[in-house]
């Protein structure tokens, strides 16, 4: 058989990054100033770096602050996100279904019942594994019927979260080829919701996705 | 819901070949086979073959190959059986039947029956 | 082509009992590689078409009552329902769907004493 399997690469993460800026004026003070008095209302057209006037004082975006929002914060503290996901791009062949024009099309009802069936199928043949979310079909074509689909998985965040994902990464490939496997036609018949090509099976990409806590902080900046 | 739909009795002549409908609703009709069988009244029950509406493609159980010949019309989404120069062998009730799914081999669904009488 | 045979051929019993039927396959019905059995049971109440109760020998169609159950393995299949009610009272037949022609049992009439 030959069933394709690519490498997949991720860099590290550490836990907790604190990025340091150099403000040209002291650091970390509330957000908002109040203000009192007849000069209010010509504070109110004054706040600057995208601040805004509640009536009373400047309310003052991420990052700033000062009775005109005039100051920027010296650090930011950026934590490491709830969940990782990964998605494997993975294609078989399901050889009890006959290719029709009708699947092409994702809002026909073929297409909708051969998803939720393939997806059913799916559910069953992953169970056992906690970090799977579940399937998404990119794509159906001839042959005799080729599904091009993403399976999703996520775990809590951890430091081990790349090993995690590894791990649940080579359990999918090993249900998938075990699967398509068992599953097949016999003397053309099917006696399971659905069979498979032994050979079809194909994983393509697989994609982590990646913490980085410097982008993160452009993003909020 | 899924319905398959079939007529609740055909009189039929010997020798005189007769064509049974079977009409389909609420799944997508060319993404299944149609599975016919056959029962004689107080009897078992016979699987004849089945007929695909992608491609109008049939398989047919090896006994009933010079007796029955299934058609598919994917306009109306229905299935036929023409069972040709019947005899009182033929007198019984034809299911129509729809698997589980694809290519699947037991039957979640069933048509109501029609019963056929071979008689002069 | 794969012989089924059923037993008893009709059975007589009371509302509550407990009842067994059997299904014999002339070749095994075990797939070895996925450890499943491709065998099928079909209630027919009279005047009515045959109902899916349970398929991979012992896979509960959704809606079938739990007090169905199907049990056994490659040549040799029961059929048992834990507690008989009135409307059970119909032929059950067994199916092969290990390989064509797919084949069924004569069938076992359940009636009520």
């Known amino acids: 058989r030959t069933t394709s399997f690519p490498t997949v690469t991720t860099t590290a993460v550490p836990t907790n990054t604190t990025i340091k800026s150099n403000p040209t004026s002291t650091p970390t003070v509330p957000r908002t100033t109040t203000c009192f008095g007849d000069g209010c209302q010509n504070t109110a057209s004054r706040c600057k770096n995208g601040g805004t006037w509640d009536g009373l004082k400047c309310q003052c975006p991420n990052l700033y602050y000062g009775e005109l929002c005039e100051e920027v914060v010296s650090s930011i503290d950026i934590g490491p996100p709830e969940t990782i996901s990964a998605q494997m791009e993975l294609t078989v062949t399901v050889t009890s279904v006959k290719f029709t024009e009708e699947l092409k099309n994702h809002s026909s009802q073929e297409f909708q019942e051969f998803k939720q069936t393939f997806t059913e199928q799916m559910n069953i043949v992953y169970s056992g594994i906690p970090e799977y979310v579940g399937v998404n079909i990119t794509k159906l074509r001839l042959g005799s019927v080729v599904v091009e689909h993403d399976v999703l998985l996520r775990t809590k965040y951890t430091p081990e979260y790349k090993t995690v994902l590894d791990n649940a990464t080579e359990v999918v490939k090993e249900k998938i080829t075990k699967v398509t496997t068992q599953q097949i036609m016999i003397n053309d018949i099917c006696s399971d919701m659905m069979c498979f090509n032994t050979t079809g099976t194909q994983v393509q990409n697989i994609t982590v996705t990646q913490y980085d806590p410097e982008e993160d902080c452009r993003k909020m900046a | 819901q899924v319905q398959l739909q079939q007529p609740g009795a055909e009189l039929v002549r010997p020798g005189a070949s007769v064509k049974l409908s079977c009409k389909a609703s609420?799944?997508?009709?060319?993404?299944?086979?149609m599975h016919w069988v056959k029962q004689r009244p107080g009897q078992g029950l016979e699987w004849i073959g089945m007929s695909h509406p992608s491609d109008s493609e049939s398989r047919l159980n090896q006994k009933f190959k010079d007796k029955a010949t299934l058609t598919v019309d994917k306009s109306s989404s229905t299935a036929y059986m023409q069972l040709s120069s019947p005899t009182s062998e033929d007198s019984a009730v034809y299911y129509c039947?729809?698997?589980?799914?694809?290519?699947?081999?037991?039957?979640?669904?069933w048509g109501q029956g029609t019963l056929v009488t071979v008689s002069a | 082509d794969i012989v089924m045979t059923q037993s008893p051929s009709s059975l007589a019993m009371s509302v509550g009992q407990k009842v067994t039927m059997s299904c014999k396959s002339s070749q095994s019905l075990l797939n070895s590689s996925n450890q499943k059995n491709y065998l099928a049971w079909y209630q027919q109440k009279p005047g009515q078409s045959p109902k899916l109760l349970i398929y991979f020998a012992s896979t509960r169609e959704s809606g079938v009552p739990d007090r169905f159950i199907g049990s056994g393995s490659g040549t040799d299949f029961t059929l048992s329902i834990s507690s008989v009610q009135a409307e059970d009272l119909a032929d059950y037949f067994c199916q092969q769907h290990y390989s064509f022609p797919l084949t069924f049992g004569a069938g076992t009439k359940l009636e009520l004493r």
């Open positions: 609420g799944y997508s009709f060319t993404i299944y086979w």
């Open positions: 039947s729809r698997p589980y799914y694809g290519s699947s081999a037991w039957f979640a669904d």
